[in-house]
């Protein structure tokens, strides 16, 4: 699937809904086009099937072009863990859009990651806390479900619960972003 991102304007962000994290600004601080792959260098690809998009984790043939995703970065407040209502610094959140008007979303009930067509303001499920990891990798934590990350399960993207004190280095939640 091609990534047509011209006229792709992310001009308004999230309207906070009493969630545990709030987006500071209504527009992204920056945007970037990048291909997404797993720690083991499998590509994340998107295909239109029966009028909906499917997400695949697969080995790409050498000559096949990688699908690009538009990452929109937002500055966000991190809540104080003690009081719950105070602010404990800043963090970066992202939305991921592989094609115009479609965004990756967390489906916490099904523990799945899905592509949905949406309008602004985007729902909370479309926002992920971006974590900077070793080995030039990142992780994506659900805004709506702290401790739950996008991961790879059975060659698909899924939501995976992570125990901070043990598995933050789990390879199945590590992803590579490449701008080339």
């Amino acid at each position: 699937m091609g990534s047509s991102h011209h006229h792709h304007h992310h001009s308004s962000g999230l309207v906070p809904r009493g969630s545990h994290m709030s987006i500071t600004g209504i527009s992204p601080i920056t945007e970037s086009l990048a291909s997404l792959s797993t720690y083991n260098d499998q590509s994340i690809t998107f295909a239109l099937e029966d009028e909906s998009y499917e997400i695949y984790v697969e080995d790409l043939k050498k000559d096949k072009k990688k699908d690009k995703v538009l990452l929109s970065y937002y500055e966000s407040q991190h809540p104080s863990s003690e009081s719950g209502d105070g602010v404990d610094g800043k963090m970066l959140m992202v939305t991921l859009s592989p094609t115009k008007d479609f965004w990756l979303q967390a489906n916490n009930k099904e523990h799945s990651v899905e592509l949905h067509k949406c309008e602004k303001p985007l729902p909370d499920q479309a926002f992920f806390v971006l974590h900077n990891r070793s080995f030039n990798c990142v992780s994506f934590e659900c805004k709506t479900d702290p401790g739950v990350f996008i991961g790879v399960k059975d060659n698909h993207l899924a939501l995976i619960k992570v125990d901070y004190s043990e598995n933050l280095g789990s390879e199945n939640i590590l992803f590579k972003l490449s701008e080339t």
Partner: antibody, heavy 119, light 111 residues
């Protein structure tokens, strides 16, 4: 309130050892990457070492590799820096720092503890 | 390693004046589309304080008179109107890659 309090600094002879501690409070310690940054008297800042949340990864500046070890005890909300084979050039104020949530920048700093290596 | 060079070494200004501090990196500090360049303020006898992260975003509780700009290798910290408490040393720092490095600092002193 988020707080980092360093201790363990002092005067030590060249070749000696010292262990610095950093007691953290006011946040979920295990969720954050932690680092040590030092500042020699009258000089600039130098990153020393980092340990990720979950104790998975550690990184060091070349000048301390093999001599310093960063570690953490999440049950005690404490960060450590074990310093062996100390040299005069290790003399500095050592700051404990916490990354922001997501590990993109040093966000919270302790007051520092002074380590003096001298005979 | 990425070397950060700050200029000027010292800036002598009066309260109310505009301060412009520069930081140049030996190579791009961009990663994932983000400029991973941060600014810190340090006063004598105190630890550094985060002012700006990712080139242009203010840290928690940082007044609006502080702003950051730039991308790639060239970055600027601007203090729009100096307050008495702003006279301090300012450091830039890159978090693109290990070893994380700091500039040598710019001292903003009262003229």
């Amino acid at each position: 309130e988020v707080q980092l309090v360093e201790s363990g600094g002092g005067l030590v002879q060249p070749g000696g050892s010292l262990r610095l501690s950093c007691a953290a409070s006011g946040f979920t310690f295990s969720s954050f990457s932690m680092s040590w940054v030092r500042q020699a008297p009258g000089k600039g800042l130098e990153w020393v070492a980092t340990i990720s949340g979950g104790k998975t990864f550690t990184d060091y500046v070349d000048s301390v590799k093999g001599r310093f070890t960063i570690s953490r005890d999440d049950s005690k909300n404490t960060l450590y820096l074990q310093m062996n084979s100390l040299r005069a050039e290790d003399t500095a104020v050592y700051y404990c720092t916490r990354a922001n949530y997501g590990n993109w920048f040093f966000e919270v700093w302790g007051q520092g503890t002074l380590v003096t290596v001298s005979s | 390693e990425i070397v950060l060079t700050q200029s000027p070494a010292t800036l002598s200004l009066s309260p109310g004046e505009r301060a412009t501090l520069s930081c140049r990196a030996s190579e791009s500090v961009a990663k994932y589309g983000l400029s991973l360049l941060n600014w810190f303020q340090q006063k004598p006898g105190q630890p550094p304080r985060l002012l700006i992260f990712a080139a242009s975003n203010r840290g928690s509780g940082i007044p609006a008179r502080f702003s950051g700009s730039g991308s790639g290798t060239d970055f600027t910290l601007t203090i729009s109107s100096l307050e008495p408490e702003d006279f301090a040393v300012y450091y830039c720092q890159q978090s693109k890659e290990v070893p994380f490095t700091f500039g040598q600092g710019t001292k903003v002193e009262i003229k």
